[in-house]
Interface confidence: medium
C-alpha cells in the first residue's frame, strides 16, 4: 500500500477519505487505527457502527469521527480540533472477524496555524523531499507519500 498524506491546520478539522470497492467489502465494518511505530501494531481509534447497515451513522471517539458510505465505497474520518500530537501514520481498515485488511495508509501532517503566532517548534511534519513533484494529490490537502520518504519522525 502507498501512503497518502493528508495535511491539516492545528486547531481546525481534517477530513480523511479512504475509497474502497463497495462490492468486495460488502457487509464489512470499517475502522481507523493509529500505527504505533514503524513495525508496531495498529491501535484502534474508532470503528463504524456495530450494525453494518447503520455504518452511515457518524461515530465519535473523543475528537475523531468515522462514517461509511457503503454504497459509494468511501470511508470518511474527521479529526476535529487537530493537535500536534495527532500527526503520524494511520490506517483505514476493513474488518473481518478478528482480522483487518488495510484499505489505505494515511500520514497525517499537522501544520501550524498561520494566525497563531506562538512557537510552532512542537509541530512535526516531514520535510518536503525532492521526490514530491510527482505526488498524487487526492485533494488540496493530501498527497501520496513516495518511496524512500520516512513516515515517522526521527527518534531522538
Amino acid at each position: 500500500h502507498n501512503t497518502t498524506v493528508f495535511q491539516g491546520v492545528a486547531g481546525q478539522s481534517l477530513q480523511v477519505s479512504c475509497p474502497y470497492d463497495s462490492m468486495k467489502h460488502w457487509g464489512r465494518r470499517k475502522a481507523w487505527c493509529r500505527q504505533l511505530g514503524e513495525k508496531g501494531p495498529c491501535q484502534r481509534v474508532v470503528s463504524t457502527h456495530n450494525l453494518w447497515l447503520l455504518s452511515f451513522l457518524r461515530r465519535w471517539n473523543g475528537s475523531t469521527a468515522i462514517t461509511d458510505d457503503t454504497l459509494g465505497g468511501t470511508l470518511t474520518i474527521t479529526l476535529r480540533n487537530l493537535q500536534p500530537h495527532d500527526a503520524g501514520l494511520y490506517q483505514c481498515q476493513s474488518l473481518h472477524g478478528s482480522e483487518a485488511d488495510t484499505l489505505r495508509k494515511v500520514l497525517v501532517e499537522v501544520l501550524a496555524d498561520p494566525l497563531d503566532h506562538r512557537d510552532a517548534g512542537d509541530l512535526w511534519f516531514p520535510g518536503e523531499s525532492e521526490s514530491f513533484e510527482d505526488a498524487h494529490v487526492e485533494h488540496s490537502i493530501s498527497r501520496s507519500l513516495l518511496e524512500g520518504e520516512i513516515p515517522f519522525p526521527p527518534t531522538s
Partner: antibody
Framework: EVQLVESGGGLVQPGRSLKLSCAAS????????MAWVRQAPKKGLEWVAT????????YYRDSVKGRFTISRDNAKSTLYLQMDSLRSEDTATYYC??????????WGQGASVTVSS | DIQMTQTPSSMPASLGERVTISCRAS??????LNWYQQKPDGTIKPLIY???NLQSGVPSRFSGSGSGTDYSLTISSLEPEDFAMYYC?????????FGGGTKLEIK
Amino acid sequence: EVQLVESGGGLVQPGRSLKLSCAASGFTFSDSAMAWVRQAPKKGLEWVATIIYDTSSTYYRDSVKGRFTISRDNAKSTLYLQMDSLRSEDTATYYCALFGVDVMDAWGQGASVTVSS
Amino acid sequence: DIQMTQTPSSMPASLGERVTISCRASQGISNYLNWYQQKPDGTIKPLIYYTSNLQSGVPSRFSGSGSGTDYSLTISSLEPEDFAMYYCQQYDSSPWTFGGGTKLEIK
C-alpha cells in the same frame, strides 16, 4: 431457512428477450445483496451480475453489460434478471445467490435458459 | 480479468483419504478467495470464505489455506457425500471469477 427459487427459464430464439425471477424467503431481502451466476452446459460457474441496494448499485460482467439488467422488488422479495438481445453463448443454467459478507451464502436450484433457433 | 486455474481437473480418491485441491490466481488476490461445492444434482453451497474461514454448518474436515496467488482446499478424510465438483472463486476484483472446477470421483 433461506430459500431462493428461480423461474422464467426456457427456450428462446437469438436476439429475443427473457426475464428470470428469483423468489426469496427466510431472510431480510431488502437488506441483502444478491447476485446471478450462470453455468453453461458441462462448463464452470460464471458470475453475471450483482445488485447491492437498488438499480443505482449494480455490477455486470462485460459480456452482458447493456444487454442484461438486474433489478429487485423488495416488497415482493424478488430478484430479477432481464435478458435482452440473447445470444447462443448465453445458454446456461442461471443461479440466483444471496451475497453475504465475503461469500455467496445461499444458492437457488437454477433456471435453465436455452438460446437457439 | 483475473484467471483462476484449478488443479487437478478431476481426482479419483477413496473414502477416508486426505485430498487437496489447488487454485492459482493470475495475480495476487490478497486472500479474497472462496470455495464452493456443487453436487451432481446442481446444488451449490459455500464451504470456505476468505481463504480459510469455514462456512457455518460445514464439517471441520474441510479446510482452506493459501496467500498471494496460491490457494488450496483440503478434505482431511473423505466421506461419501464429499464426491462432487469443487470451485474456487476470487472476489479481489470485478469481475468475480471462478476456477474451472475439480471433480472429486470415487476411485
